[in-house]
């Protein structure tokens, strides 16, 4: 008898997963940029806003060249999970002033979830160590005031924007190594 029948190809492979992650990240970056601009229009920011519970920016332009696939994907996934939780919290805790942005925040959360699942699939297919996606979160208390939730929104969107920006660059660089 000849060799056993092979398996048909599944819908994607690791390279296609990485391409898809790049596209999703770019699209999420555009959404975040647009939402951050809307926030600035509606609620002008008085300087930069920080939130202690947000992850610190993982990469700088100088470290891009030394990126390794496992480190980038693990860190990106952990950071995006944190932002996902912060967007969730913002939607729950937002006062009436932020309710006008609810559809955009909901769409942003859904896109973040899609990207997180794509990254998980990519890491599974590459058999890279998986950081648990649902690690215990930093407890987020309700904002002190309506202005507190607006400042938090500025901080979350600003941080997410920077994270996605390095993520696009990092993922594109990793494509050449896979």
């Amino acid at each position: 008898p000849g060799p056993p029948a092979g398996s048909p190809r599944v819908s994607s492979d690791p390279r296609a997963d990485l391409d898809s992650a790049v596209l999703l990240t770019r699209s999420l970056l555009a959404d975040t940029r647009q939402l951050a601009a809307q926030m600035r229009d509606k609620f002008p920011a008085d300087g930069d806003h920080n939130l202690d519970s947000l992850p610190t920016l993982a990469m700088s332009a100088g470290t891009l060249g030394s990126l390794q696939l496992p480190g980038v994907l693990t860190r990106l996934r952990v950071d995006l999970m944190s932002y996902f939780r912060h967007v969730q919290w913002l939607r729950r805790a937002a006062g009436p002033s932020l309710k006008t942005l609810e559809p955009e925040l909901g769409a942003l959360q859904a896109r973040l979830e899609r990207l997180l699942r794509r990254l998980q699939l990519l890491m599974s297919r590459l058999a890279l160590p998986q950081a648990a996606p649902d690690q215990p979160a930093v407890p987020l208390g309700p904002p002190a005031s309506a202005w507190g939730s607006i400042r938090a929104a500025h901080a979350i969107l600003g941080g997410l924007h920077l994270t996605l920006d390095w993520a696009v660059r990092g993922l594109l660089l990793l494509k050449t190594r896979l």
């Epitope: 092979g6 398996s7 190809r9 599944v10 492979d13 690791p14 390279r15 496992p70 699942r117 998980q120 699939l121 599974s124 297919r125 590459l126 058999a127 890279l128 160590p129 998986q130 648990a132 996606p133 649902d134 896979l178």
Partner: antibody, heavy 114, light 112 residues
């Protein structure tokens, strides 16, 4: 079409060794993590070991830790499983699988018996 | 004993809808990891049926669907056919293993 072809199975005495190979074709082998999964006669699937796409990460089920070694040669599109100190309970069909696992070979039977 | 729990058997008549459950723990499904489903026809190797909770590989009919909630997942097969008679396994990554864990398998019988 994706093909994974296992070889190296057979009858071995308890305490003996075997080396399984899995020849891959039809996909970019070096982009996939690879697994060994086994199935004892009439039983369910049991994950044995995994190796990352570039060979830098290797993990094992507790039941085989210290006895089995997984390795790969991306230049030859081949996955290996070195099995030492074999026991009767290692008797099973051993499947090589790629990715999630997305693709599976047809399996090779390993029988450990005196 | 398997880390993911499935009913050992399930059955249905042609045309019916059947569901197979898969229950995990906080180190696998409950930790947020995706669930994959495999079909193993008698005497053959397993085949990927559903990946990432609810995605179908090309060639898998849309009669097969998956879902996940909390620490559990389920596989639904609608419009049951005789050729669906097989063993079905769920799998998910597990933190304590650093690898995938499988359910014990569910033997699906198509009656009549």
């Amino acid at each position: 079409e994706v093909q994974l072809l296992e070889s190296g199975g057979g009858l071995v005495q308890p305490g003996g060794s075997l080396r399984l190979s899995c020849a891959a074709s039809g996909f970019t082998f070096s982009s996939y993590g690879m697994h060994w999964v086994r199935q004892a006669p009439g039983k369910g699937l049991e994950w044995v070991s995994v190796i990352s796409y570039d060979g830098s990460y290797k993990y094992y089920a507790d039941s085989v830790k210290g006895r089995f070694t997984i390795s790969r040669d991306n230049s030859k599109n081949t996955l290996y499983l070195q099995m030492n100190s074999l026991r009767a309970e290692d008797t099973a069909v051993y499947y090589c699988a790629a990715g999630v696992p997305d693709y599976w070979g047809q399996g090779t039977l390993v029988t450990v018996s005196s | 004993q398997s880390v993911l729990t499935q009913p050992p058997s399930a059955s249905g008549t042609p045309g019916q809808r059947v569901t197979i459950s898969c229950t995990g723990s906080s180190s696998n499904i409950g930790a947020g990891y995706d669930v994959h489903w495999y079909q193993q026809l008698p005497g053959t190797a397993p085949k990927l049926l559903i990946y990432s909770n609810n995605e179908r590989p090309s060639g898998v009919p849309d009669r097969f669907s998956g879902s996940k909630s909390g620490t559990s997942a389920s596989l639904a097969i609608s419009g049951l056919r005789s050729e669906d008679e097989a063993d079905y396994y769920c799998a998910a990554w597990d933190d304590s293993l650093n690898g995938p864990v499988f359910g014990g398998g569910t033997k699906l019988t198509v009656l009549g």
